[in-house]
């Protein structure tokens, strides 16, 4: 008989069995070649095995599927569609599997999929319908509540002739399928900006991680509708100042904790409102660590220790007085 998972530990399929069973329909609790399975834990791990495609013979009991550290390259439509369907699959981790293309409907027929991790894949081509599965203006709601997309930016020479931010946002917003999403991680993606409509259409977000990007400004981003937001990670970006509108929106969110460490804050006259806010707000975590990066004379000064006299702007000289 084919190897099955034991009740208490992971079992591995011997690679030589793969060809022997590939011609027949998979047995219900079979473990795919190059994978480890635990029926007790409802878990299948196919990790660091250089797989080039998703195993077809995944056991129907699988609830947690790890396909990390492989060489999948492309995730086609219905990559996880099986008969009978993988009705229990709730957590799918595909990180670090050299995916560069995720096609429309790649995650269709996974009715229980709540957590998806595509981190550390150079996604040059993420279909707008990767998560919604259809190009209808309003799709069936996705069951996803957690979507991890950290470091999915491809090298510059592999990017399509379009905005990477735009490609990702199109996938997040297509068909309004992700209205139930609670956690979204987009760290380390070289984002220069956040398209203004993205947050308004993800009203259920509890946790948003935008750390280690290149965001310069939040002026056109609205957080007002994110009334459930509990954590907002903006560490390690290129933020220079937060303006009054943003400060008011953040201050009004009932559950929020904001993380702002390691941004190149510009401590000139435009920073006065933010400093005033920081001195009184309780929503910024570790606010005593925030320091100025510019101008040079202010470098490393702690924002909380500044007063209005410190925050000046050089006067703009009339043209007749400017030197070349």
């Amino acid at each position: 008989s084919s190897p099955t998972s034991s009740a208490s530990s992971f079992s591995s399929s011997a690679p030589f069995l793969a060809s022997a069973v590939s011609a027949q329909p998979p047995l219900p609790d079979q473990c795919p070649a190059l994978c480890e399975c635990s029926e007790a834990a409802r878990t299948v791990k196919c990790v660091n095995r250089n797989l080039t495609e998703v195993p077809t013979d995944l056991p129907a009991y699988v609830r947690n599927l790890f396909l990390t550290g492989n060489q999948l390259a492309v995730l086609p439509a219905g990559a996880f569609a099986r008969r009978p369907p993988l009705a229990e699959l709730a957590a799918l981790n595909l990180s670090g599997s050299r995916l560069d293309e995720v096609r429309a409907g790649a995650f269709e027929h996974l009715p229980s999929l709540r957590q998806l991790d595509l981190s550390h894949n150079p996604l040059a081509d993420l279909s707008p319908f990767a998560f919604s599965g259809s190009n209808a203006s309003v799709s069936a709601p996705s069951p996803l509540v957690e979507l991890i997309l950290n470091h999915i930016v491809p090298p510059e020479d592999e990017r399509q002739n379009r905005s990477f931010e735009g490609m990702v946002v199109a996938a997040l917003l297509a068909g309004r399928a992700l209205q139930g999403l609670r956690r979204l991680e987009l760290a380390s993606n070289h984002f220069l900006y956040l398209p203004r409509d993205v947050l308004a259409q993800l009203p259920s977000l509890r946790h948003l991680d935008l750390s280690n990007n290149s965001l310069v400004s939040l002026t056109y981003v609205s957080f007002r509708n994110l009334t459930h937001l509990e954590s907002l990670h903006l560490e390690d970006n290129a933020l220079k100042v937060l303006h009054n509108g943003t400060l008011a929106e953040l201050q009004g969110l009932p559950h929020i904790r904001v993380f702002l460490d390691n941004n190149p804050w510009v401590c000139d006259c435009h920073m006065a409102d933010m400093v005033t806010w920081l001195k009184e707000t309780e929503v910024v975590q570790g606010k005593d660590r925030l320091t100025c990066a510019y101008p040079e004379k202010m470098r490393n000064r702690v924002l909380l220790e500044l007063n209005s006299a410190d925050l000046d702007c050089d006067p703009i000289l009339p043209p007749s007085l400017q030197t070349s």
Epitope: Q251, R257, Q285
Partner: antibody, heavy 122, light 111 residues
Framework: EVQLVESGGGLVQPGRSLRLSCTAS????????MSWVRQAPGKGLEWVGF??????????ENSASVKGRFTISRDNSKSILYLQMNSLKTEDTAVYYC?????????????WGQGTLVTVSS | DIVLTQSPLSLPVTPGEPASISCRAS??????????LQWYLQKPGQSPQLLIY???NVESGVPDRFSGSGSGTDFTLKISRVEAEDIGVYFC?????????FGGGTKVEIK
């Protein structure tokens, strides 16, 4: 389900000390500011103080009426909030409530314990 | 410290009728566009329960007959149709500044 359970109240003589505990469950304790509020018999509510969360270094703020006498602390490994009360006075007699601040602490307390009675009398 | 003054001190009510309680602050409790003013109900023998936060947001699980309004220094809690279970003492609280302070309370009782 968020739960807060106070303990440690009782009868104590003026000038003595007492430590109240509040055991929390049902949420990530380190993420939240925690506070103590008291209510003298037949009177209104009085804020005693709070202790900040991990992100803000577990620093504390106290009301003027208890400053220098009462200390708020927390054991995050056990999810327990403490109120160390020294140099107790008869006017400290009250039901002491432990309360959790909302994620944005500016919106104050969203969950309260059932309270523990402290009676300071000779 | 910010002083909160509640009125009336006592409010006899008839079930099914509306009721209104006022809370006035000695200085503004607004900060960056939000008024940090809460309303709590303490039923007899129980701990306080949050009804309204941020002046007008109804806490999850609180019946929609409760509503809060106001900004700056003047605030109102309204009960559209009082029910027997609404009796108790109502407190307003400001969390704009440390120390946080409470109003003296309004006792709502059935006529």
């Amino acid at each position: 389900e968020v739960q807060l359970v106070e303990s440690g109240g009782g009868l104590v003589q003026p000038g003595r000390s007492l430590r109240l505990s509040c055991t929390a469950s049902g949420f990530t304790f380190t993420d939240y500011y925690m506070s103590w509020v008291r209510q003298a018999p037949g009177k209104g509510l009085e804020w005693v103080g709070f202790i900040r969360n991990k992100g803000n270094g577990y620093t504390t703020e106290n009301s003027a009426s208890v400053k220098g006498r009462f200390t708020i602390s927390r054991d995050n490994s056990k999810s327990i909030l403490y109120l160390q009360m020294n140099s107790l006075k008869t006017e400290d007699t009250a039901v002491y409530y432990c309360a959790r601040y909302r994620g944005n602490p500016h919106y104050a307390m969203d969950y309260w314990g059932q309270g523990t009675l402290v009676t300071v009398s000779s | 410290d910010i002083v909160l003054t509640q009125s009336p001190l006592s409010l006899p009510v008839t079930p099914g009728e509306p009721a209104s309680i006022s809370c006035r602050a000695s200085e503004s409790v607004e900060f960056y566009g939000t008024s940090f003013l809460q309303w709590y109900l303490q039923k007899p023998g129980q701990s306080p329960q949050l009804l309204i936060y941020g002046a007008s947001n109804v806490e999850s699980g609180v019946p929609d007959r409760f509503s809060g309004s106001g900004s700056g220094t003047d605030f109102t809690l309204k009960i559209s149709r009082v029910e027997a279970e609404d009796i108790g003492v109502y407190f307003c609280q400001q969390s704009r500044k440390v120390p946080s302070t409470f109003g003296g309370g309004t006792k709502v009782e059935i006529k």
